[in-house]
Interface confidence: medium
């Protein structure tokens, strides 16, 4: 979690925030937190509320994707008078409350980040004692997960007329640039497909016609690193098969 900027449309920061006699509901979250895959990231969330000295039962919730309706990834509950928020849900055991809801802090830590965690998260607090009230961040915090390239698949496939084509699929954020090298190729970007819908971190490059036997190498590179993998083409000349 690298860069964080405050969302001024959602964060009503002012010097009277702790002393105002009639505090309104507000939530302070940064619009974006950036972190690298494998790291732990913290999603900050603090709030103000109009119920002075509220000490009743409360529930802290984080959801992903969209406010109010997105799936919950974390939930904890604190009993009346208790500062301990007992975890009731932590998706895959990777979400942990760092803030103290009694101190108006719902900050959450996400462990072992993966590219799939790259989405928007929304914090919510619910009061359920003498006071029944709730509030949820509307804009949320976008967790931007970056990752060095990783080649997830490289293969040689038959194509019409006894020809062969090579496919290389890599993931990373920023989406990696792919390049093929091989016999009589030099260094070719080949036919690079845009990231697929629903697979925004995956990029595929195709070599439509492999004309020579030998080793074909796919290289994926972005600002965080590079990765390469190779596939071998050896055709049994005079036969229709190939060994890869």
């Amino acid at each position: 979690f690298v860069r964080t900027k405050i969302d001024t449309t959602e964060n009503l920061l002012n010097t009277e925030v702790h002393s105002s006699p009639a505090q309104r509901w507000s939530m302070q979250v940064p619009p974006e937190v950036s972190a690298e895959a494998g790291d732990a990231a913290v999603l900050p969330c603090t709030f103000t509320h109009p119920h002075r000295h509220y000490d009743g039962p409360l529930t802290a919730i984080w959801r992903a994707g969209e406010p109010y309706a997105g799936p919950q990834v974390f939930r904890c509950a604190a009993a009346r008078g208790s500062e301990l928020c007992q975890t009731a849900l932590s998706l895959h055991g990777r979400f942990r409350l760092l803030g103290n809801p009694r101190r108006n802090d719902l900050s959450l830590r996400v462990e072992r980040l993966a590219l799939a965690d790259d989405r928007r998260y929304f914090c919510r607090v619910e009061f359920a004692g003498d006071v029944h009230d709730r509030y949820e961040s509307r804009h949320g915090v976008r967790l931007h997960v970056t990752a060095a390239p990783r080649i997830v698949n490289i293969s040689v496939l038959p194509s019409p007329a006894h020809a062969f084509r090579a496919l290389c699929t890599a993931e990373g954020e920023p989406p990696p640039a792919l390049a093929w090298s091989g016999p009589a190729l030099g260094n070719s970007l080949a036919a690079v497909r845009s990231p697929r819908e629903g697979h925004g971190h995956l990029v595929t490059a195709e070599l439509p016609a492999l004309t020579h036997d030998g080793r074909y190498t796919c290289t994926a590179a972005n600002s965080l690193g590079r990765s390469e993998a190779s596939v071998y083409l050896f055709r049994f000349h005079g036969a229709s098969g190939a060994s890869t």
Epitope: A40, P44, L98
Partner: antibody
Framework: QVQLQESGPGLVKPSETLSLTCTVS????????VHWVRQPPGKGLEWIVL???????TYNSALKSRVTISKDTSKNQVSLKLSSVTAADTAVYYC?????????????????WGQGTLVTVSS | DIQMTQSPSSLSASVGDRVTITCKAS??????LAWYQQKPGKAPKLLIS???SLETGVPSRFSGSGSGTDYTFTISSLQPEDIATYYC?????????FGGGTKVEIK
């Protein structure tokens, strides 16, 4: 009482790997995180990395490609490795305790510090 | 990254004077600010967290205030033992960043 002590070679050659150890006492690495911070001579402070109580890590992205942090809870030690060093890595390196690791607030402060160890990068 | 701009970089004051140091963040940091004191040849010492909360054992002449992007550290009555460099640090956003420091000397 809480104490942290950095140790390691005071001189490292350019392009080599700097290795430092922080030995702690008065608290358990199972319950507290540890930061590494450095300070070039006559300059300000630069945060490097935090290892949380459960072993998770959070790095300064500007240094992450060269930094490795690990810990041995049973030995009360946290180690830092910085690869491919240059003269710009000459600094006093501090380890410091992260005080609110376990559910009392996301406060990235450093409440206890070691005395620091000077590492000079020179051939 | 959030930049922390501290001023002045150095100051000289008399014993008993009121000393004020300011720290400006390049973006809102929601009061998640700490102040440290570093005496020559020593490690930094945490004085204040949460922009205003004095750490246990820190003399009450030290105080902090501010909100949003602008924060202030005050020594109400400078003492000889306060000769040091003072740093602010934000922890709202990783990477954690420090101000450039303010060196306080006695006239």
């Amino acid at each position: 009482q809480v104490q942290l002590q950095e140790s390691g070679p005071g001189l490292v050659k350019p392009s080599e790997t700097l290795s430092l150890t922080c030995t702690v006492s008065g608290f358990s690495l199972s319950n507290y995180g540890v930061h590494w911070v450095r300070q070039p001579p006559g300059k300000g402070l630069e945060w490097i990395v935090l290892i949380w109580s459960d072993g998770s890590t959070t790095y300064n992205s500007a240094l992450k490609s060269r930094v490795t942090i690990s810990k041995d809870t049973s030995k009360n030690q946290v180690s830092l490795k910085l690869s491919s060093v240059t003269a710009a890595d000459t600094a006093v390196y501090y380890c410091a305790r992260h005080p609110y690791d376990d559910y009392s607030g996301y406060y990235y402060t450093m409440d206890y510090w070691g005395q620091g160890t000077l590492v000079t990068v020179s051939s | 990254d959030i930049q922390m701009t501290q001023s002045p970089s150095s100051l000289s004051a008399s014993v008993g004077d009121r000393v004020t140091i300011t720290c400006k963040a390049s973006d809102h940091i929601n009061n998640w600010l700490a102040w440290y004191q570093q005496k020559p040849g020593k490690a930094p010492k945490l004085l204040i967290s949460g922009a205003t909360s004095l750490e246990t054992g820190v003399p009450s002449r030290f105080s902090g205030s501010g909100s949003g992007t602008d924060y202030t550290f005050t020594i109400s009555s400078l003492q000889p033992e306060d000769i040091a460099t003072y740093y602010c640090q934000q922890y709202w956003s990783s990477p954690l960043t420090f101000g450039g420091g303010t060196k306080v000397e006695i006239k």
